[in-house]
Interface confidence: low
């Protein structure tokens, strides 16, 4: 068991919350069965443990949000994986019932008599994780507590399901929605031929589910669907790769429902296989915007188009977080790892020095440099200050006229806050409206992004478009600069004057070859011939019959 | 230093077999890119043969070498090219090359070549 | 197969001078080719790959250019050592394939 997943991030309160995140890469393959976790996480871990201390700063410093009440949290680390996960989510479980079993706080001993530490207080809720998989796994447990779970990332439709997952919410909307986005984008560009693949696990599988549903209705074929890990090895994505290379040159669009790293994983193919410039990928909110995915493998990436959720970056929390240094910050019990990985040196005298590192830290290094704030940072945000306005709702109703926690509230009774938590109602972070339906989601608004060479060996993402309640907006020039780019992904041209479809036994109905109507037969639908009845002959355009007009032969008439 | 250097070249009789060994120095072919096969006939340009792909193994022919001609890794750095049914078309100097894509990113080491001569 | 074709089998310029080099590829290869000089007794050695990219320790004077069928490699401030045959190489990812262009001799006067 590796000891870095044992380090938790402490504040103290009268209300804990407990928060998941991947302060960790997912063990590889190899290290799952001993579930040791891969390397810090800026974004999507240093990030949302910073978010989610300064959150509770902000929150606690405000007088109209939860007066007299101290909200504090304990977070640990999910490293993107669910047996990790559970393991951390079992240790939030055990301080809950300690907690339950010692009012008082005096813990009983094996032996019968009592010790004089006071225990923990319990979770009241948990934030998080990013991951749908994770999330699922980690409510199957928090549920049977009666611990609502509020997630800022986990998109999966199957989460929508209450009977299912009762304690689970979410401040962004169901994969369903991002599902119909990209099937709009692919109608957009007549596409009607292209690949699949999706991550293996919840997310991916759902998303692609849905994916491949929507697309039937919608007349698109795909030529075949593919399914990775995102911890695969290099073989499996060369393999993967070359699947995908036999569907061209038709297929040359690949929707991806991927988490980031498959989509990483297939560009690090891309490039052992010198085939940049293949496909045009089309990827989910894994991918959105993010740097590390694309970092080092932009021309495999250029062109890709995908779905970002829209969430305008907080300025801040930049203001906080860019001033971070680890001399002084030391209630993120991993920001000297962090420091130490982000800036590939060593922090000399530090308890966390990592003498793998030659190059000493020096004090002028700064966060600022390359700063990319976490695309879904709104999200976090958001998904905290749900749980403390749910908890200020629950705090007016249950102590009316009482600054601070009263009788009534303790100990906070999960199924009353779970039913304050559905009935929140805010203005979020970026001035949008957060609330939640009756399943516990979010509305669905996306961005569309666009990765383009901007200049010679730049490359960034653009915003090409978006999607906000099925209605689809982008800017066709900004895509392709002239039509005769549009990529074409079809399997088979549309069949000329007088000319049948002709589709293959086994065949996708997007596939089929074109076989002209025998002499006297008209194009009777676009898949059959029909013979013109005696006495008529098809029409100039092939669509129908016309009577041959009759002539009458005459004695003097010269042979025809 | 990686350096790649080809060997087996020589004469031999129309109808004949050959096997050319391409070994590298500083080169482990256990790693992620291709090794290849390009000749050269005489005062003449330059022609493709084969890749294989380290990572799994898999082999890329052009058309005409299909089914005369096999690429394979025999050990951790050492390539080889049969070449059967031989005839006096088949002169050539071959080149052993490797690249980080099949053709796409170009091939970026390359023996000094191994003539091979065929004639009765 | 891919047929990659190039013109002119041949040409002269002055150091200082600028040669273009052109490769048709009779399919698009979107940006799947690379470039390689070659001197007599010598392999060749790689110059550009993807269309436009400087393969390490290429001078600047080297320029790759075009996407799809239409390819062009320029070679500006003519030096005595550019003396050489140039050769393109086409690669077609859905079949897998290459093909080498038949050859460009470079004369410096």
């Known amino acids: 068991q590796s000891s870095e997943r044992r380090v938790v991030a402490h504040m103290p309160g009268d209300i804990i919350i407990g928060a998941l995140f991947s302060v960790h890469h997912q063990p590889t393959v190899d290290k799952v069965h001993e579930r040791k976790c891969g390397a810090v996480r800026e974004q999507y871990g240093i990030q949302r443990v910073e978010a989610m201390l300064h959150t509770l700063e902000r929150i606690n410093s405000d007088p109209t949000l939860l007066p007299n009440i101290t909200l504090g949290c304990e977070i640990r680390d999910s490293c993107w994986h669910s047996a990790v996960a559970l393991e951390q989510s079992i240790e939030f479980i055990r301080d809950s019932l300690i907690s339950s079993e010692e009012e008082e706080g005096l813990v009983r001993c094996v032996d019968g008599s009592s010790s004089s530490f006071r225990s923990k207080k319990p979770i009241v809720g948990v934030i998080g994780p990013g991951s749908s998989s994770v999330a699922i796994q980690v409510q199957n447990l928090l549920q049977l507590f009666n611990i609502p779970q509020i997630a800022y990332s986990a998109t999966s439709m199957d989460l929508s399901d209450k009977t299912l997952f009762k304690y689970f919410m979410r401040v962004v909307p169901s994969d369903a929605q991002q599902a119909r986005a990209m099937v709009d984008i692919v109608k957009r560009y007549n596409w009607t031929y292209v690949s699949a693949v999706h991550t293996e696990g919840n997310y991916g599988e759902s998303g692609m589910e849905a994916f491949k549903d929507m697309s039937a209705k919608e007349g698109i074929c795909i030529a075949h669907s593919y399914k990775i890990y995102s911890n695969a090895g290099e073989q499996s994505f060369d393999k993967l790769l070359k699947k995908l290379t036999s569907h061209l040159p038709k297929a040359r669009v690949v929707a991806c429902f991927c988490e980031g790293m498959t989509v990483r994983g297939l560009l690090m193919a891309m490039r052992r296989l010198g085939l940049a410039g293949e496909f045009l990928l089309l990827g989910s909110d894994g991918w959105a915007d993010r740097y590390d995915v694309t970092d080092g493998y932009q021309r495999e990436a250029v062109g890709g188009i995908t779905i970002k959720l829209q969430s305008p970056d907080v300025k801040w929390f930049d203001d906080y977080y860019l001033k971070l240094r680890p001399e002084t910050n030391h209630r993120n019990p991993w920001f000297q790892e962090f420091w130490q990985h982000r800036f590939q040196c060593r922090l000399e005298g530090f308890p966390q020095e990592n003498s793998k590192y030659n190059k000493t830290c020096n004090s002028s290094l700064t966060l600022k440099t390359h700063h990319v704030q976490d695309s879904k940072m709104g999200f976090v945000i958001n998904a905290i200050y749900s749980m403390a306005y749910g908890l200020h709702n629950m705090q007016m109703s249950l102590c009316p006229g009482y600054a601070g926690l009263c009788d009534a509230m303790k100990p906070i009774d999960g199924r009353k806050l779970l039913e304050s938590l559905m009935k929140t109602n805010f203005t979020g972070v970026s001035g949008d409206t957060i609330l939640f339906d009756e399943n516990g989601d979010s509305p669905g608004r996306y961005e569309i992004m666009n990765f383009k060479e901007m200049g010679k060996d730049y490359f960034d993402y653009i915003n090409v478009g978006s999607w906000d309640n099925g209605e689809l907006k982008m800017d066709d020039d900004e895509v392709w600069s002239k039509k005769s780019n549009i990529i074409r992904s079809v399997c088979s041209e549309p069949c000329e004057k007088g000319q049948i479809k002709v589709i293959r036994k086994g065949e996708v109905s997007c596939c089929w070859t074109c076989t002209p109507c025998k002499e006297n037969e008209y194009v009777f639908d676009e898949y059959t011939c029909k013979a013109c009845q005696l006495g008529s002959w098809p029409t100039d355009d092939l669509t129908g019959c016309d009577l041959i007009p009759v002539q009458y032969l005459r004695w003097g008439d010269p042979e025809p | 230093q990686q350096q790649l250097e080809e060997s087996g070249g020589g004469l031999v009789k129309p109808g004949g077999t050959l096997t050319l060994t391409c070994k590298g120095s500083g080169i482990d072919f256990n790693d992620y890119y291709y090794m290849c096969w390009v000749r050269q006939a005489p005062g003449k340009g330059l022609e493709w043969i084969a890749c294989?792909?380290?990572?799994?193994?898999?082999t890329y022919y052009a058309n005409w070498a299909k089914g005369r001609f096999t690429i394979s890794k025999t050990s951790s750095t050492t390539v080889t090219l049969q070449m059967t049914s031989l005839t006096a078309a088949d002169t050539a100097t071959y080149f052993c090359?490797?690249?980080?894509?099949?053709?796409?990113?170009?091939?970026?080491?390359w023996g000094p070549g191994t003539l091979v001569t065929v004639s009765s | 197969d891919i047929v990659m074709t190039q013109t002119p089998a041949s040409v002269e310029a002055a150091v200082g001078g600028t040669v273009t080099i052109k490769c048709q590829a009779s399919e698009s290869i979107y940006s799947n080719l690379a470039w390689y000089q070659q001197k007599p007794g010598q392999p060749p050695k790689l110059l550009i790959y993807r269309a436009s990219n400087l393969a390490s320790g290429v001078p600047s004077r080297f320029k790759g250019s075009g996407s799809g069928t239409e390819f062009t490699l320029t070679i500006s401030d003519l030096e005595c050592a550019d003396a050489a045959t140039y050769y393109c190489q086409g690669y077609y990812a859905s079949t897998v394939t290459n093909a080498f262009g038949g050859g460009t001799e470079v004369v410096v006067k």
């Open positions: 090359a490797r690249g980080s894509g099949v053709g796409s990113y170009g091939y970026n080491f």
């Open positions: 294989i792909y380290n990572g799994d193994g898999e």
